[in-house]
C-alpha cells in the first residue's frame, strides 16, 4: 500500500523557459499524513539531491507546500518532494524533472534548390539552440493545392527534401514552421517558380576533336542534361593547357543559349588542352551545374613559328688556310616548334660561291671552312613544314670585330640574373649572351642565348646556381658579322666566403710586422670580396681590427710592442658576410736589427 506515492507534484512534466520563474506544488495525501504523522510543514524540497532553503517554500495549507525558482539557469533539474518522518528520517514523496529551454526563433534565410533528377530540397537557418526537441516542418502549396508536409529529420533539422515531383512553371509557396514545447513560429513565406531554382546535371560525354585545316582550333561536343527540354541553357566552358593549374574561360556571351558543340579558337598549335563545361538556366536564375568530367585534345601541328637561335664557335687552333667551325643552335620551345621536330637544315655558302646543304638531327654541326667569309642559314622542320631561316654571317679570318655594347651591367633581381647594356649606334641584328662558371678546378663551360636586336635588357635563361661566379659575355651581331664582345662577372646570389684568408708574416721587426696573404680562390669566394679585416692581439691585450681594401695582398702592422707574442687572423667579406681564416702567431724581436741591449 505504501508503494502508492505519498503525494504528487504539480505540474507533473514541466517544460519552462530558461531564466524564467517556476513554481511547483507538492500535495500530500491524507493517508500518508496520517501514517507518518506529518503535514505540509514537514516537507523538504530538494534539487539534484541538494536541499532547497526554507525561504523558497510557501506553506499553502496543511497538505500543500510550494517552492519557487527564479531565473532558472539549468537545462535539467531533478526536483523531489520529501517529508521528515520519525527521527528526522527523510521519506521521498514524489519527484519530477524540470526541463528548461527556449522557444524556437523564427526560421530565416529559407532557400530551395531543385537538383535535376531529384526532388526539391529547402534549407533554412533554424536560429539559436533551444535545448529542447524542436520540430521543423516545411510547408508548401500552390494557389489551388496543398502539398504534403515535409518533416525535417532529427539529424538534419534545417533542411528537408519534399516527397512530391517538382512542377516547373507553376508558382509554389513555401514556408517553415518550427515548434517545441514552448512555442511555435513560422518563417516568412517565399513564393517562386521552381524553374528558377534548378541546378542542372552537368553536360556529359564531353569530347574534343582537332582540325587538320586549322591548328588553332578544337571542336567540343557534349550531351546536354535532359532538362534542356524544359529550359534554355547557358554554359561556362573553361580550358587550360595540360600542365597549367589556372583555367581560361570562353567569353560567356559566346555560349549564352542551348547548344551541344562549340569551337574554341586562338589556341596554340600542337598543344594538349583540357576542357570542362557546366551549364545553368540562361537567364542566370538558379544554380550552375557541377563541372563536367574533363576531356582533353591536342591541336594539330603547324609549321614552326620561329627560326632557332643560331651561333657559332671557331676552334682557336686552326690549320693553315682552314678553320674548324662549330655551328650551334637551340631547340625551339614547344610553343614555337608547333609540332614534333623532324630535323634541321643547314646551308653554308662561301662568299659569292657554291652552296652546301646539311640535314642534321642534333643541335650542332662541325664543319671545316676556308678562311673566307660564309653565309650560314638554318631552318627547322616538322610534319607541316619549315620555319623561316635564321641567317648568320661567319666573317673571313682577317675580320676585325668592332662596336661592342657599352655600359655592360649584370645584377640579380627576383631570383634571376639580369644583364643590361647600352646599344651601339650601329644597327644590331641580334645579341649573343654567353656565360660560364669561373672555377679554379674546372674549365669554363659556356651556355648561351640569343636576344633580338632591339633588346638591351634580359635575364639569363639557364639553370644558374647561387654563390657561383658567372663570367657573362655579350656580343652584338651585325649584318657583316659579330661585334667585339664585352664581359662582366656576376653572382645570382652571394654568400659569405667558404674559407677565410690564410695570413703569414713576410717580415717582422721590433715594432712592426709585414703581413701577406693570397687572394682567395674563386671557388671559395662565394661573392665579390669587398674588403678584408685583420684582427690582432697580444695574450693579455684587447683585439685590434684593421680594414684593408680587397685589392691588397699585404699590410704592415705598426706600433707593435717588442718581444711580444701576437695572434693574428684575417676575415674576408662579401656583400653577404665574412669568414675568418686560421689564426697565426708571431713574436716581435726584443731588439731591432743591429741594436744592442
Amino acid at each position: 500500500e505504501l508503494l502508492d506515492p505519498c503525494g504528487y507534484i504539480s505540474p507533473e512534466s514541466p517544460v519552462v523557459q530558461l531564466h524564467s520563474n517556476f513554481t511547483a506544488v507538492c500535495v500530500l495525501k491524507e493517508k500518508c499524513m496520517d501514517y507518518f504523522h506529518v503535514n505540509a510543514n514537514y516537507i523538504v524540497w530538494k534539487t539534484n539531491h541538494f536541499t532547497i532553503p526554507k525561504e523558497q517554500y510557501t506553506i499553502i495549507n496543511r497538505t500543500a507546500s510550494s517552492v519557487t525558482f527564479t531565473d532558472i539557469a539549468s537545462l535539467n533539474i531533478q526536483l523531489t518532494c520529501n517529508i521528515l518522518t520519525f527521527g528526522q528520517l527523510e521519506q521521498n514523496v514524489y519527484g519530477i524533472t524540470i526541463i528548461s529551454g527556449l522557444p524556437p526563433e523564427k526560421p530565416k534565410n529559407l532557400s530551395c534548390i531543385v537538383n535535376e533528377g531529384k526532388k526539391m530540397r529547402c534549407e533554412w537557418d533554424g536560429g539559436r539552440e533551444t535545448h529542447l526537441e524542436t520540430n521543423f516542418t516545411l510547408k508548401s502549396e500552390w494557389a489551388t493545392h496543398k502539398f504534403a508536409d515535409c518533416k525535417a529529420k532529427r539529424d538534419t533539422p534545417t533542411s528537408c527534401t519534399v516527397d512530391y515531383s517538382t512542377v516547373y512553371f507553376v508558382n509554389i509557396e513555401v514556408w517553415v514552421e518550427a515548434e517545441n514545447a514552448l512555442g511555435k513560429v513560422t518563417s516568412d513565406h517565399i513564393n517562386f517558380d521552381p524553374v528558377y531554382k534548378v541546378k542542372p546535371n552537368p553536360p556529359h560525354n564531353l569530347s574534343v576533336i582537332n582540325s587538320e585545316e586549322l591548328s588553332s582550333i578544337l571542336k567540343l561536343t557534349w550531351t546536354n542534361p535532359s532538362i534542356k527540354s524544359v529550359i534554355i541553357l547557358k554554359y561556362n566552358i573553361q580550358y587550360r593547357t595540360k600542365d597549367a593549374s589556372t583555367w581560361s574561360q570562353i567569353p560567356p556571351e559566346d555560349t549564352a543559349s542551348t547548344r551541344s558543340s562549340f569551337t574554341v579558337q586562338d589556341l596554340k598549335p600542337f598543344t594538349e588542352y583540357v576542357f570542362r563545361i557546366r551549364c545553368m538556366k540562361e537567364d542566370g536564375k538558379g544554380y550552375w551545374s557541377d563541372w563536367s568530367e574533363e576531356a582533353s585534345g591536342i591541336t594539330y601541328e603547324d609549321r614552326p613559328s620561329k627560326a632557332p637561335s643560331f651561333w657559332y664557335k671557331i676552334d682557336p687552333s686552326h690549320t693553315q688556310g682552314y678553320r674548324t667551325v662549330q655551328l650551334v643552335w637551340k631547340t625551339l620551345p614547344p610553343f614555337e616548334a608547333n609540332g614534333k621536330i623532324l630535323d634541321y637544315e643547314v646551308t653554308l655558302t662561301r662568299w659569292k660561291s657554291h652552296l652546301q646543304n646539311y640535314t642534321v638531327n642534333a643541335t650542332k654541326l662541325t664543319v671545316n671552312l676556308t678562311n673566307d667569309r660564309y653565309l650560314a642559314t638554318l631552318t627547322v622542320r616538322n610534319l607541316v613544314g619549315k620555319s623561316d631561316a635564321a641567317v648568320l654571317t661567319i666573317p673571313a679570318c682577317d675580320f676585325q670585330a668592332t662596336h661592342p655594347v657599352m655600359d655592360l651591367k649584370a645584377f640579380p633581381k627576383d631570383n634571376m640574373l639580369w644583364v643590361e647594356w647600352t646599344t651601339p649606334r650601329e644597327s644590331v641584328k641580334k645579341y649573343i649572351l654567353e656565360w660560364c662558371v669561373l672555377s679554379d678546378k674546372a674549365p669554363c663551360i659556356t651556355d648561351w642565348q640569343q636576344e633580338d636586336g632591339t633588346v638591351h635588357r634580359t635575364y639569363l635563361r639557364g639553370n644558374l646556381a647561387e654563390s657561383k661566379c658567372y663570367l657573362i659575355t655579350v656580343t652584338p651581331v651585325y649584318a657583316d658579322g659579330p661585334g667585339s664582345p664585352e664581359s662582366i662577372k656576376a653572382y645570382l646570389k652571394q654568400a659569405p666566403p667558404s674559407k677565410g684568408p690564410t695570413v703569414r708574416t713576410k717580415k717582422v721587426g721590433k715594432n712592426e710586422a709585414v703581413l701577406e696573404w693570397d687572394q682567395l680562390p674563386v671557388d671559395v669566394q662565394n661573392g665579390f670580396i669587398r674588403n678584408y679585416t685583420i684582427f690582432y692581439r697580444t695574450i693579455i691585450g684587447n683585439e685590434t681590427a684593421v680594414n684593408v681594401d680587397s685589392s691588397h695582398t699585404e699590410y704592415t702592422l705598426s706600433s707593435l710592442t717588442s718581444d711580444t707574442l701576437y695572434m693574428v687572423r684575417m676575415a674576408a667579406y662579401t656583400d653577404e658576410g665574412g669568414k675568418d681564416g686560421p689564426e697565426f702567431t708571431f713574436t716581435t724581436p726584443k731588439f731591432a736589427q743591429g741594436e744592442i741591449e
Epitope: 531543385v114 535535376e116 533528377g117 515531383s165 517538382t166 512542377v167 516547373y168 512553371f169 507553376v170 546535371n201 542534361p225 535532359s226 532538362i227 527540354s229 524544359v230
Partner: antibody, heavy 128, light 108 residues
C-alpha cells in the same frame, strides 16, 4: 470564361499551305501552351504541336518538316501553317489551351495538366 | 514515340452501371496521363489530369487511377450524358504527345 475560336479556309488544294488562326477571348495568352490537334474523319486525335506565349515551339516529329506555329500576343492569337498538304491532311482541326506546368520525374519531364479549353474545331478538306 | 493502347475499343453499358476503361503505355509515364470525353461533332473535354486529379467542374463519379504503364478511368454510376468516346493521352514532354485510339461507350 476563356473561349477559343478557329478560323481559316475550309478547302485547300493539294501541295498548297493550310493556314489556320485561333483567337483567344476572355483571358490572357500568357502562362499557357497553345496547342493544335487534328482528328481525321472517323479517327482518333493527333497532336500537331504547340507554342508558348514566349514563342517556344514543340512539334510532332511526323509533321515537323511541314509545320509552323506562331503567336501574336498583341492580337491574342496563335496560328498554324501546314505546307505541302495532301488528302491525308483532311481533318477537323482543333486549337486548345494547355496550362503551363512541367513535372520532373527523375530526368523525365511531363506536362502536368491536360488541355483544359478547346475550340469547337474547324473542318479542313484537302481536295483539288 | 510512346504508344497508348486503350481497351476495350468499344463497350455497351446501362445507366447506373460502373464502367472501367483501361489505358496502357508502351513505356512508363509515371502518373502523367489525362482522360478526355468527346461527344459526336464536339471538341474533346478534359476529365482527369495527372492520372487521378479531377478537372474542375467534372462530376465526382469520374475517377482515374494508375501509374507507370497501366491506367484506369472509372465511371462509378453511368449517367445518360456519359455515353461518348473516351481518350487517354500521355503527356511526356518530349514530342510527341500521343492519344489512345479511343473507347466508344454506347447505351446497351
Amino acid at each position: 470564361q476563356v473561349q477559343l475560336q478557329e478560323s481559316g479556309p475550309g478547302l485547300v488544294k493539294p501541295s498548297e499551305t493550310l493556314s489556320l488562326t485561333c483567337t483567344v477571348s476572355g483571358g490572357s495568352i500568357s502562362n499557357y501552351y497553345w496547342t493544335w490537334i487534328r482528328q481525321p474523319p472517323g479517327k482518333g486525335l493527333e497532336w500537331i504541336g504547340h507554342i508558348s506565349n514566349s514563342g517556344t515551339t514543340n512539334y510532332n516529329p511526323s509533321l515537323k518538316s511541314r509545320v509552323t506555329i506562331s503567336v501574336d500576343t498583341s492580337k491574342n492569337q496563335f496560328s498554324l501553317k501546314l505546307t505541302s498538304v495532301t488528302a491525308a491532311d483532311t481533318a477537323v482541326y482543333y486549337c486548345a489551351r494547355l496550362p503551363l506546368g512541367i513535372a520532373a520525374v527523375d530526368t523525365d519531364y511531363y506536362y502536368y495538366f491536360g488541355m483544359d479549353v478547346w475550340g469547337q474545331g474547324t473542318t479542313v478538306t484537302v481536295s483539288s | 514515340d510512346i504508344q497508348m493502347t486503350q481497351s476495350p475499343s468499344s463497350l455497351s453499358a446501362s445507366v447506373g452501371d460502373r464502367v472501367t476503361i483501361t489505358c496502357r503505355a508502351s513505356q512508363s509515364i509515371s502518373s502523367y496521363l489525362n482522360w478526355y470525353q468527346q461527344k459526336p461533332g464536339k471538341a474533346p473535354k478534359l476529365l482527369i489530369y495527372a492520372a487521378s486529379s479531377l478537372q474542375s467542374g467534372v462530376p465526382s463519379r469520374f475517377s482515374g487511377s494508375g501509374s507507370g504503364t497501366d491506367f484506369t478511368l472509372t465511371i462509378s454510376s453511368l449517367q445518360p450524358e456519359d455515353f461518348a468516346t473516351y481518350y487517354c493521352q500521355q503527356s511526356y514532354s518530349t514530342p510527341p504527345i500521343t492519344f489512345g485510339q479511343g473507347t466508344r461507350l454506347e447505351i446497351k
